[in-house]
């Protein structure tokens, strides 16, 4: 399987909420001994490899934000820790994997990475990640919404 990022750039005003999304593409093994570990973290555009550096999101590490579930299951972070920081990660039946960040501030701007690992009975088999940029802009009215786009094209849509 591969990970796709439907949008590579999210531009949001301060105070808004945003949902960053990654999507699993290709065949996903749903055997009884196959599980998936999914998480999010901040990074920087490295010289060699994007997403190689790991930084916390609002002081929460990749392990704090992870989901671990069977190939046929949906999941979301239910623990209070993430929600106290205005964060929630979720995964649905269709391969969509997201993190929602509430009440954005300028400090949330940066590169975000999703990581998906296929685990076959205790063994980490396949690791893939996706990257996207979040730009939080100051001084916009609270009525304005986030815009999501692919940097290489001019199309953009209003994001949740």
């Amino acid at each position: 399987f591969k990970v796709a990022t439907p949008y590579s750039l999210y531009v949001c005003p301060e105070g808004q909420n945003v949902t960053l999304t990654c999507r699993l593409l290709g065949p996903v093994d749903k055997g009884h001994d196959v599980t998936f570990y999914k998480t999010w973290y901040r990074s920087s555009r490295g010289e060699v490899q994007t997403c190689s550096e790991r930084r916390p999101i609002r002081n929460l590490t990749f392990q704090d934000l992870h989901l671990h579930h069977g190939g046929h299951q949906a999941a979301n972070t239910s623990h209070d820790l993430a929600q106290r920081h205005g964060l929630e990660s979720a995964s649905d039946h269709h391969g969509n994997f997201s993190i929602t960040m509430r009440n954005l501030t300028l400090l949330d701007s940066g590169l975000y990475c999703c990581l998906v690992v296929e685990i076959r009975h205790h063994h980490s088999e396949h690791r893939v990640h996706g990257a996207m940029e979040l730009q939080v802009q100051a001084g916009k009215g609270s009525g304005s919404t986030c815009m999501a786009s692919n940097e290489q094209d001019s199309d953009s849509i209003t994001a949740a």
């Epitope: 690992v117 685990i119 205790h122």
Partner: antibody, heavy 121, light 106 residues
Framework: QVQLQQSGAELMKPGASVKISCKAT????????IEWVKQRPGHGLEWIGE????????NYNEKFKGKATFTADTSSNTAYMQLSSLTSEDSAVYYC??????????????WGQGTLVTVSA | QIVLSQSPAILSASPGEKVTMTCRAS?????MHWYQQKPGSSPKPWIY???NLASGVPARFSGSGSGTSYSLTISRVEAEDAATYYC?????????FGGGTKLEIK
Amino acid sequence: QVQLQQSGAELMKPGASVKISCKATGYTFSRYWIEWVKQRPGHGLEWIGEILPGSGSTNYNEKFKGKATFTADTSSNTAYMQLSSLTSEDSAVYYCAGEEVYDGYPWFGYWGQGTLVTVSA
Amino acid sequence: QIVLSQSPAILSASPGEKVTMTCRASSSLSYMHWYQQKPGSSPKPWIYATSNLASGVPARFSGSGSGTSYSLTISRVEAEDAATYYCQQWSSNPYTFGGGTKLEIK
């Protein structure tokens, strides 16, 4: 905070059986494998087998088939290992360990304090 | 089964020294885990997936290797590092540990 609390030391007669418990707190017990490990002085660590509490699925090291039996009670978040037909070779510290998936890599992330089983006539 | 052979069995070092212990596998592995155990205590997760330090492990520890050969290195040994270190594979049943390397501090 994840904790695995094991039952206390046991002094057993040869030929008897013993049942060791491992109570888990602080995580979703049913979803992660519980591993059992044997340690004899000078023999290092030896994997006995594992149980997935939610399904009751088990895997055994061939060497311990017929010797160890795993069960789990999800209502009390407790896993059990029964050792049968005890001999002096079974005298050891037995650990339960909880699988942790860290950074996408499963490993023996959480350990009980160990249960000493002594087999003596 | 995959046999993990650790060497040396006992390693003696003075504080500040650099030490390396090795773990050789009888079959090629994708990665290796390491655990630290002190006398009278349970093993602790120490290095995961060959080279990644568990939370709270001092940066003087490092791990490396691939295939059948893996190693754990301490750049400057401290007294608190005295322990036995075990490598472990979770690639195939039965899951196995190495025999351990006991690190003694002079």
